[in-house]
């Protein structure tokens, strides 16, 4: 060992996404999502792992049900703390239908625009969280292809709660939400038994999102 060698004490930080990514979270806020607190808890746990800022990761949130609302744009907040405060305040907007294709398409066409803070040359990531089959499934194939054409990486999360509560088959639902996820599906698709279980996937989801910058 060289005589100039020094031991430096250091603490390994909690893994953070300190890279440049533009992330838009697309939240199903339709009537069947319950309890909503579980969704905001999931957001909190995911967002606090991110190093958010104009030169680091930016996050925007879109909520959909029978229509769509931009909760906040990519460039609205310039720190993790600010985003966490804003995310906690997001209220469930409800809706008579679950328009997943509309939510995704609005995120692609509007949330990922420079006017709303998207940065040129920065990787685009979409995280879609939903608890039911879409009523605009007939539009989904084209919408996903449009995302693919724009190199938007998609992580999709199926919440099986309302199906399990109603003792309904989840097969078609899971198939639909898998079709939303980027390839390879096994790395981009998640399903949870109910809304409360969302927090259990945060660590893995976070790691997979952060890994994108290395690809």
């Amino acid at each position: 060992v060289s005589p100039t060698f020094q031991v430096v004490n250091s603490i390994a930080p909690v893994q953070e996404c300190s890279t440049q990514l533009d992330i838009v979270i697309v939240l199903d806020g339709s009537n069947s999502i319950y309890p909503w607190d579980s969704v905001t808890a999931f957001l909190n746990d995911l967002l606090e792992r991110m190093d958010i800022g104009p030169k680091q990761t930016q996050v925007g949130i879109v909520q959909y049900g029978e229509n769509v609302t931009h909760e906040f744009n990519l460039n609205k907040y310039s720190s993790t703390e600010e985003v966490l405060v804003a995310a906690k305040k997001i209220v469930q907007r409800g809706g008579r239908q679950t328009m997943t294709a509309l939510g995704i398409d609005t995120a692609r066409k509007e949330a990922f625009t420079e006017a709303r803070g998207a940065r040129r040359g920065v990787k685009k990531v979409m995280v879609i969280v939903t608890d039911g089959e879409s009523h605009d499934n007939h539009r989904l194939k084209k919408v996903i292809q449009d995302c693919e054409d724009e190199n938007i990486q998609r992580f999709s999360i199926a919440i099986l709660g309302s199906y399990n509560r109603g003792n309904l088959s989840t097969e078609k639902f899971v198939e639909e939400i898998k079709s939303i996820a980027s390839e390879p599906t096994e790395k981009h698709f998640f399903n949870v038994s109910d809304e409360l279980a969302l927090v259990t996937i945060v660590k893995t989801l976070g790691e997979r999102i952060f890994a994108l910058e290395a690809t």
């Epitope: 029978e66 229509n67 008579r96 239908q97 328009m99 509309l102 039911g132 089959e133 879409s134 009523h135 605009d136 499934n137 007939h138 539009r139 989904l140 109603g166 309904l168 078609k172 639909e176």
Partner: antibody
Framework: EVQLVESGGGLVKPGGSLRLSCAAS????????MSWVRQAPGKGLEWVGR??????????DNVAPVKGRFTISRDDSKNTLYLQMNSLKTEDTAVYYC???????????WGQGTTVTVSS | DIQMTQSPSSLSASVGDRVTITCRAS??????LNWYQQKPGKAPKLLIY???SLQSGVPSRFSGSGSGTDFTLTISSLQPEDFATYSC?????????FGPGTKVDVK
């Protein structure tokens, strides 16, 4: 390709019955809310009724002139929508269309239509 | 039930003209207002949804505007293939009523 194809139209006497079918393909039919719309000769479009998906109870709504006479149903295993028309009247003569229906997009997919003629 | 009215009921125009059709709902419809084009013997075709969104594949000369109860369809420069009947429809609450239609023919 997303497609709707109606069938079952024809000539029927007043008081008679007819069942129209609409075969769906290219999308997950079981998710969709579906409607029937009709158009009498030389007239405007008239919404007949809607059926929700089975997960929402498959509930139906109908327009006043057909209530109690027309019934909308669906068979998700066959990807088919039906319109059972009983006690037909001459004013039910029209081209009948099936459509995919959402609040946001309205009716963005239509079949080609099937003609129903009620005449003695 | 929500009543939909349209004006004019018919209009004559020439290729290149700017055409405006109005639609009024008897009560607020949360911008769930759609415009359809229909040609004789054919099924209606969605042009505009949610008051102002252009349906995929529809030329940009078609535009929709308005909110609350009053809505407008505009064709910025009429083309030969645009001669048809145009109908508005509310999709806010059943019954999903249509306007009576506006026939656009050649002057």
């Amino acid at each position: 390709e997303v497609q709707l194809v109606e069938s079952g139209g024809g000539l029927v006497k007043p008081g008679g019955s007819l069942r129209l079918s609409c075969a769906a393909s290219g999308f997950t039919f079981s998710n969709a809310w579906m409607s029937w719309v009709r158009q009498a000769p030389g007239k405007g479009l008239e919404w007949v009724g809607r059926i929700k998906s089975k997960t929402e109870g498959g509930t139906t709504d109908n327009v006043a002139p057909v209530k109690g006479r027309f019934t909308i149903s669906r068979d998700d295993s066959k990807n088919t929508l039906y319109l059972q028309m009983n006690s037909l009247k001459t004013e039910d003569t029209a081209v009948y269309y099936c459509t995919i229906t959402t609040h946001y997009y309205g009716m963005d997919v239509w079949g080609q239509g099937t003609t129903v003629t009620v005449s003695s | 039930d929500i009543q939909m009215t349209q004006s004019p009921s018919s209009l004559s125009a020439s290729v290149g003209d700017r055409v405006t059709i109005t639609c009024r709902a008897s009560q607020t419809i949360n911008n769930y207002l759609n415009w359809y084009q229909q040609k004789p013997g054919k099924a209606p075709k969605l042009l505009i949804y949610a008051a102002s969104s252009l349906q995929s594949g529809v030329p940009s000369r078609f535009s929709g505007s308005g909110s609350g109860t009053d809505f407008t369809l505009t064709i910025s420069s009429l083309q030969p293939e645009d001669f048809a009947t145009y109908s508005c429809q509310q999709s806010n609450s059943p019954p999903f009523t249509f306007g009576p239609g506006t026939k656009v023919d050649v002057k």
